[in-house]
């Protein structure tokens, strides 16, 4: 019973985690304009893995896709790859784990097969979670580096009379979604691996057979042996539009210039 619960919970946690990884990958708010200690601009910039957006105070939001592959920073490409690998592995892991669930009967599938599938999906979830965490962390590190570089520029590049509004970027919501989702997928994977141990059938316990030979009594007990580990990989991509930030009502994205009533 505890095994079934652990497996079921591991599956649900991983499912939520992978949904979160997909959401994070698609979100536009990986980096958002830093508003602290900055002049209050009437324009708010934010960027995702696939496009960058500008939201005006007026409510008008404009997003532009990154329509180049070669022109993008290698780090951004690496983050995209990690997130996609994470989603692909997670999706495969989910597929495998559905068939591995103890509560689902598929023909005459043996418990040992279910145990192997549970372990496989668990490992896939772990790797998927690690990929997401790595991707988000690489992006966060990139942001921190750029933030301090642009901060240095703000204070050294003020020689002229004309000032520029330096747009610095800080952590966006997608990073936190990604970290939490990656963590959940990782936890779900660990739970699946734990469940696998309980699912694996104990080897047949033959009764001990005593052989009497020349005064010695030796008892042979065939023992069971378990093992297995492995590693996998990750993702899939889909685009959603996340209009948001600040208060919902003042952040409306409208495509046309006028509103006809």
């Amino acid at each position: 019973m505890a095994v079934t619960a652990c497996q079921g919970l591991g599956f649900v946690v991983s499912l939520i985690g992978i949904a979160g990884i997909i959401a994070a990958t698609c979100m536009d708010q990986w980096s958002t304009q830093d508003l602290y200690n900055n002049p209050v601009t009437a324009v708010f910039n934010y960027q995702g893995l696939w496009r960058s957006c500008v939201r005006e105070s007026s409510g008008f939001t404009e997003c532009r896709g990154y329509f180049t592959l070669l022109g993008l920073p290698a780090m951004l490409q690496a983050v995209r790859a990690l997130m996609i690998v994470g989603i692909v592995l997670g999706a495969i892991g989910l597929l495998v784990s559905i068939f591995a669930l103890k509560c689902i009967r598929i023909g005459s599938m043996e418990d040992s097969a279910k145990a192997n599938m549970t372990l496989t999906s668990g490992i896939m979830f772990i790797v998927s979670g690690l990929c997401a965490i790595a991707g988000v962390s690489v992006f966060a590190n990139m942001l921190v580096t750029n933030f301090w570089m642009s901060t240095a520029n703000m204070y050294t590049g003020m020689g002229g009379m004309v000032q520029t509004v330096q747009t610095r970027y800080t952590f966006g919501a997608a990073l936190f979604v990604g970290w939490v989702a990656g963590g959940l997928t990782l936890i779900g994977g660990v739970m699946m691996c734990i469940a696998c141990r309980g699912l694996a059938p104990e080897e047949t316990n033959y009764k001990a057979v005593s052989y009497h030979a020349s005064g010695h009594s030796v008892a042979y007990k065939p023992g069971g042996f378990k093992a297995s580990t492995g590693f996998g990989s990750n993702t899939k991509n889909k685009k959603i539009y996340d209009g948001g930030a600040r208060t919902e009502d003042e952040v409306q994205s409208y495509p046309s210039k006028h509103d006809y009533v």
């Epitope: 304009q33 002049p39 209050v40 601009t41 009437a42 324009v43 910039n45 960027q47 960058s52 957006c53 500008v54 005006e56 105070s57 007026s58 409510g59 008008f60 404009e62 532009r64 004309v162 000032q163 520029t164 509004v165 747009t167 208060t247 009502d249 003042e250 409306q252 409208y254 210039k257 006028h258 509103d259 009533v261």
Partner: antibody, heavy 118, light 113 residues
């Protein structure tokens, strides 16, 4: 069509606060910020602040924070600006304006001429 | 606050003439996110509220005659009227729409010779 209706004139005694109104119609009022602009006779334009009809969020020019208070009545789609302790310096035309694309002021009311005189 | 400096303060022209007026801001109005300049031009005729002419420094508002052209980027902007008509006589204001508080230039008055 988009309309921002303002009363033509207000005569105020020094020190007695005045509340100016601006009734918006002809568009989805809750989607656009309403701004207030001051213009003294023969002078330029000054941005006072703005209010969002949906959330009631406000953003003021620091210079007018103590002088002007922006409010609104959602049910009648009317924005208000209360001027506290008016002096002769506050005698001006006050416009209410809609904020449109590019954060530009795309539609203007006819303006309310405020005269502070005893 | 961003200071908007308009020049000249007044211009005397004859009908049909090409007119250019300048607006300079103390800070760049160019937003790196969309490469748009948040500068707006307005026209105000006597006894009327201002009227929007151009936003994003160069985008003409619908209904504005194409003799009005906005140009420039960063801190230096220009409004050009290719062939001045009698109805164009007014005060022209530029405005910073990028950083709060939103600020206006002192205006350029266009007069007929």
């Amino acid at each position: 069509q988009v309309q921002l209706q303002q009363p033509g004139a207000e005569l105020v005694k020094p020190g007695a606060s005045v509340k100016l109104s601006c009734k918006a119609s002809g568009y989805t009022v809750t989607r656009y910020w309403i701004q207030w602009v001051k213009q003294r006779p023969g002078q330029g334009l000054e941005w006072i602040g703005m209010i969002h009809p949906n959330s009631g969020s406000t953003n003021y020019n620091e210079k007018f924070k103590k002088k002007a208070a922006l409010t609104l009545d959602k049910s009648s789609s009317t924005a208000y600006m209360q001027l506290s302790s008016p002096t002769s310096e506050d005698s001006a035309v006050y416009y209410c304006v809609r904020m449109g694309l590019g954060n530009a002021m795309d539609f203007w009311g006819q303006g309310t001429s405020v005269t502070v005189s005893s | 606050d961003i200071v908007m400096t308009q020049s000249p303060s007044s211009l005397t022209v004859t009908a049909g003439e090409k007119v250019t007026m300048s607006c300079k801001s103390s800070q760049s109005l160019l937003n790196s996110g969309n490469q748009k300049n948040y500068l707006t031009w307005y026209q105000q005729k006597p006894g009327q509220p201002p009227k929007l002419l151009i936003y994003w420094a160069s985008t003409r508002e619908s209904g504005v005659p194409d003799r009005f052209t906005g140009s420039g980027s960063g801190t230096d902007f220009t409004l050009t009227i290719s062939s001045v008509q009698a109805e164009d006589l007014a005060v022209y204001y530029c405005q910073n729409n990028y950083v709060y508080p939103l600020t206006f230039g002192a205006g350029t008055k266009l007069e007929l010779r």
